[in-house]
């Protein structure tokens, strides 16, 4: 599933869409003096049956309050390059962040972008010559549009539409772990971890100091970046005198397994290299940092283990919500499973099913999780992020339930409220056995496929699987078509 393009050649701006109808950035009115009014999470529990009419009322209220809004409607997040220019992208240009403030809210969402990594001089040189925006700020556009969880539209982001939104571009190629500057010896700087710290420092002067909750989120390499940095952000805020800001994490598509590849391949470039090999090499090349408590669990030289979610998660102090497709495309890529439209071999098919099982196993003790049985990669800044459900619950709803679990105590309560779950892991065994998975299209005709068509297209043998499951082939086909 391709994301929308948010950059263009050599700094060109993409054509801007027409402005949406007037809708304020927040529904609360700014008080005259003193503290801003805190915004509350919208509690959907009472309106479960009639969400459309509820959203219509919210929109109508918002429209009527629009004239009260001092600020012009602007969906864009604006670029701020770091004032501390010693904290840099790979090429020595200053790192930065995109910000859209929401002055009535004490919630801050900091999103870490993803984009793989490079782990030696050769593949970093090649990355610099083909994906420079991931290594330099020189051509970054002045604004970005917030999508998915970064959207300020309640329809697109029922979870935190009113929060202060921060998008931190990934330009360190180090899975947000590095702390080494560019030097005579090092052609590239790897300062991912320091970039996050510096962004937080600078945001304190822009209103973050009054925050109640800071949610550090990220997708793909950014999701792994969340696991690696969330505790450090909390420590930094404590050190700087802000212990009351609750720091939480939201890791999307960054929970990888250090499993055996389907077919062993030499570690030549990022996408062929086995997960453990890539991170082992990378951590040395980047002078990568891992969370202190995790580092203590592994001996020197074994810190690479902390890049893998199931190993680092138990050592984290901050609450983290894990979002992970059970059949993640990036995981399959590094595992050398390439689904290119030809039917998969039986060995591949079993490997894929086993991957789903293994991943499900690693999420068993994760308190807050959302893991649909889909073949995809990244979700939280996709505009369709509200559409996918696990056991009847959408991701924004699960995040809302997770939020509510903190209202009583600082630590997430172990048991979710009745009817408000936030440990949601699909149990069906195949890719796209969940009917709400993102649309799959036939790669050649562009036609949408239902799950039965998709599985057959992948070489799924209904007879054999029905036999394995001890049921009639027709019954299995029916189940697949209904997505059970």
């Amino acid at each position: 599933s391709e994301g929308r393009k948010t950059w263009r050649r050599r700094g060109q701006q993409p054509p801007q869409p027409p402005p949406p109808p007037p809708l304020p950035q927040r529904a609360e009115v700014e008080p005259g003096a003193g503290q801003p009014v805190e915004s509350f999470p919208l509690d959907f529990t009472a309106v479960e049956g009639n969400m459309d009419s509820f959203m219509a009322q919210v929109k109508s209220l918002a429209q009527s309050l629009y004239p009260c809004s001092a600020q012009q409607l602007n969906e864009d997040l604006r670029l701020h390059l770091l004032l501390n220019t010693s904290v840099t992208c790979n090429d020595g240009s200053p790192a930065g962040y995109y910000l859209k403030e929401s002055k009535g809210s004490r919630r801050w969402l900091l999103f870490l972008e993803g984009g793989w990594y490079c782990f030696n001089r050769e593949n970093c040189d090649s990355r610099y010559d083909t994906m420079r925006r991931l290594m330099s700020s020189k051509d970054w556009p002045h604004t970005r549009t917030g999508t998915g969880i970064l959207s300020s539209q309640p329809e697109e982001n029922p979870h935190w539409w009113n929060a202060n939104m921060v998008f931190i571009p990934y330009c360190s190629s180090d899975v947000w772990s590095g702390a080494s500057p560019k030097s005579d010896k090092n052609e590239y700087a790897f300062m991912g971890s320091l970039i996050i710290q510096e962004v937080v420092r600078e945001l304190l002067g822009k209103g973050l100091s009054g925050a109640k909750v800071l949610l550090l989120a990220g997708s793909s390499a950014g999701g792994t970046g969340v696991l690696l940095n969330v505790d450090r952000v909390a420590e930094l805020l404590e050190e700087l005198g802000y212990p009351s800001i609750q720091v939480r994490g939201l890791a999307d598509s960054g929970w990888f397994l250090d499993n055996k590849q389907y077919r062993r391949s030499d570690c030549i470039d990022t996408i062929n290299c086995a997960p453990t090999d890539a991170i082992r090499r990378g951590i040395r090349y980047w002078s990568g940092m891992v969370p202190e408590r995790c580092q203590r669990q592994f001996k020197e030289g074994e810190e690479w283990n902390c890049f893998f979610g199931y190993k680092v998660y138990p050592t984290l102090r901050c609450p983290v919500f894990v979002v992970q497709w059970l059949f993640d495309e990036a995981q399959l890529t590094v595992d050398n499973v390439h689904l290119t439209g030809q039917p998969v071999q039986e060995g591949q098919w079993l490997y894929i099913q086993n991957l789903g099982r293994e991943l499900r196993g690693t999420l068993k003790d994760v308190q807050a999780s959302f893991a649909p049985a889909c073949l995809s990669h990244e979700i939280i800044i996709r505009s369709y992020w509200t559409d996918v459900q696990v056991k009847g619950t959408s991701l924004p709803r699960a995040l809302h339930c997770w939020d509510r679990s903190f209202h009583d105590s600082h630590k997430a309560s172990k048991t979710p409220m009745k009817g408000c779950p936030f440990h949601l892991v699909d149990s069906c065994p195949w890719p796209h056995c969940n009917p709400s998975c993102p649309t799959i299209r036939d790669q050649f005709t562009g036609q949408e496929m239902n799950v039965a068509q998709f599985l057959m297209h992948m070489g799924f043998d209904v007879q054999t699987v029905a036999q394995q499951q001890g049921m009639e082939p027709s019954k299995l086909l029916g189940m697949l078509s209904n997505g059970n």
């Epitope: 391709e2 050599r10 040189d125 090649s126 010559d129 994906m131 052609e187 990022t270 996408i271 062929n272």
Partner: antibody, heavy 119, light 111 residues
Framework: DVQLLESGGGLVQPGGSRKLSCAAS????????MHWVRQAPEKGLEWVAY????????YYADTVKGRLTLSRDNSKNTLFLEMTSLRSEDTAMYYC????????????WGQGTSLTVSS | DIVLTQSPASLAVSLGQRATISCRAS??????????IHWYQQKPGQPPKLLIY???DLESGVPARFSGSGSGAAFTLNIHPVEEEDAATYYC?????????FGSGTKLEIK
Amino acid sequence: DVQLLESGGGLVQPGGSRKLSCAASGFTFSDFGMHWVRQAPEKGLEWVAYSSSGGTTVYYADTVKGRLTLSRDNSKNTLFLEMTSLRSEDTAMYYCARASYDGGYFDCWGQGTSLTVSS
Amino acid sequence: DIVLTQSPASLAVSLGQRATISCRASKSVSTSGYSYIHWYQQKPGQPPKLLIYLASDLESGVPARFSGSGSGAAFTLNIHPVEEEDAATYYCHHSRELPFTFGSGTKLEIK
């Protein structure tokens, strides 16, 4: 105006050597990765080699590995391709191409220089 | 190495009709929301010319009748309506990882 101009082609005997050059103008040469692409008579395009913008990394197609040496002089805005142990199958039009740094696509090509390996 | 399979090898299309050329990669060339597939046009005696980059973006100066689509491992170049001057050979190319490779080419003839 962005321009690439190849030179150095001609007739060479099998086993012989040749050095091709590509002179760049109209852009900051040291900002771009550069590539050589060749095309045998009546055949398709074949990617041959890459030099990173700083010149520190070079990468070759398996078909030419060990026989080609790619280098660049950023102060003179020139890319070089030194070819040794030439074979008849190296007969082709050799193009120098600039790779865009926001996708790696070749947004500028030279006119090419023709190399014939024959006795 | 990523192998690009282009089809058909040649096609003849009537003036004003649609030409569709397919390019299939041996593994995904998409990452982080971008697809590293590009399309070139080459006429006899000339170097190739960039038409489409990153699967669907039109190079400036290229007529809007050229369009590209696809993601993952399957991509398409469409020309509609075909004009006389579009008679040429078309190549797809990936830049997802080194070594870069090209498709074998599709020769378009105008009927």
